[in-house]
């Protein structure tokens, strides 16, 4: 199987985007890739959005999807926004070689992202 | 055990048209993925095409794309591979796949059923 690796840890910001690189080792020449973000929680896995692009080019999301992303050689920069507190969890990454021949799959590890809900502003006086 | 059994190939003229079908016993048919890979005589495995059952959204392989069809029937356990204006390059072992949870990668394959495309 391919090696994908992943940061352990990401901790969301206040306006509850979380951003991570994962890295891929291509055996191959890959021209068309795709990947998939899941969430595992409570051993349920679920996926979270999926992109496929050519090399070179941008990561093309479903238009109604919470991840942005681009591409620089075999890495990919993801950010998924929106999160909140209960969106906690392990994030996984998954890649895979499309084209040409043969097809590779990698899996990551995970990248555990925290998500704190901000504070409400309290009431002011003034 | 989940196994996956493959029919439907045969021989066609090009710019015929084939269905194949995956029928998969043993186990929970509510698999994240099942898709359709192919081999041709001194080639490498290659994907042909995949569908994923949370939105049961389809991905097609460019040199497929426009001819093949995948859907998946889950009253029947079943994921089919419609083949329409085949060409002598669509000449392979195709095998199904399937895989249990988006994490597991492609844990069952079937045995694979031949397409020959040829005049």
């Known amino acids: 199987a391919m090696h994908v690796a992943q940061p352990a840890v990401v901790l969301a910001n206040s306006r509850g985007t979380a951003s991570f690189v994962c890295e891929y080792a291509s055996p191959g020449k890959a021209t068309e890739v795709r990947v998939t973000v899941l969430r595992q929680a409570d051993s349920q896995v679920t996926e979270v959005c999926a992109a496929t692009y050519m090399m070179g080019n941008e990561l093309t999301f479903l238009d109604d999807s919470i991840c942005t992303g681009t591409s620089s050689g075999n890495q990919v920069n993801l950010t998924i926004q929106g999160l909140r507190a209960m969106d906690t969890g392990l994030y996984i990454c998954k890649v895979e070689l499309m084209y040409p021949p043969p097809y590779y799959m990698g899996i990551g590890n995970g990248t555990q992202i925290y998500v704190i809900d901000p504070e409400p502003c309290p009431d002011s006086d003034f | 055990e989940v196994q996956l059994v493959e029919s439907g190939g045969g021989v066609v003229q090009p710019g015929g048209s084939l269905r194949l079908s995956c029928a998969a016993s043993g186990g929970t048919f509510s698999f994240y993925g099942m898709g359709w890979f192919r081999q041709a005589p001194g080639k490498e495995r290659e994907f042909v095409a995949d569908?994923?059952?949370?939105?049961?959204?389809?991905y097609y392989a460019d040199s497929v794309k426009g001819r093949f069809t995948i859907s998946r029937d889950n009253s029947k356990n079943t994921v089919y591979l419609q083949m329409n204006s085949l060409r002598p390059e669509d000449t392979a072992l195709y095998y199904c796949a399937a895989e249990p949870s988006g994490i597991s990668g492609w844990d069952y394959w079937g045995q694979g059923t031949l397409v020959t495309v040829s005049s």
């Open positions: 569908i994923r059952t949370s939105a049961g959204r389809t």
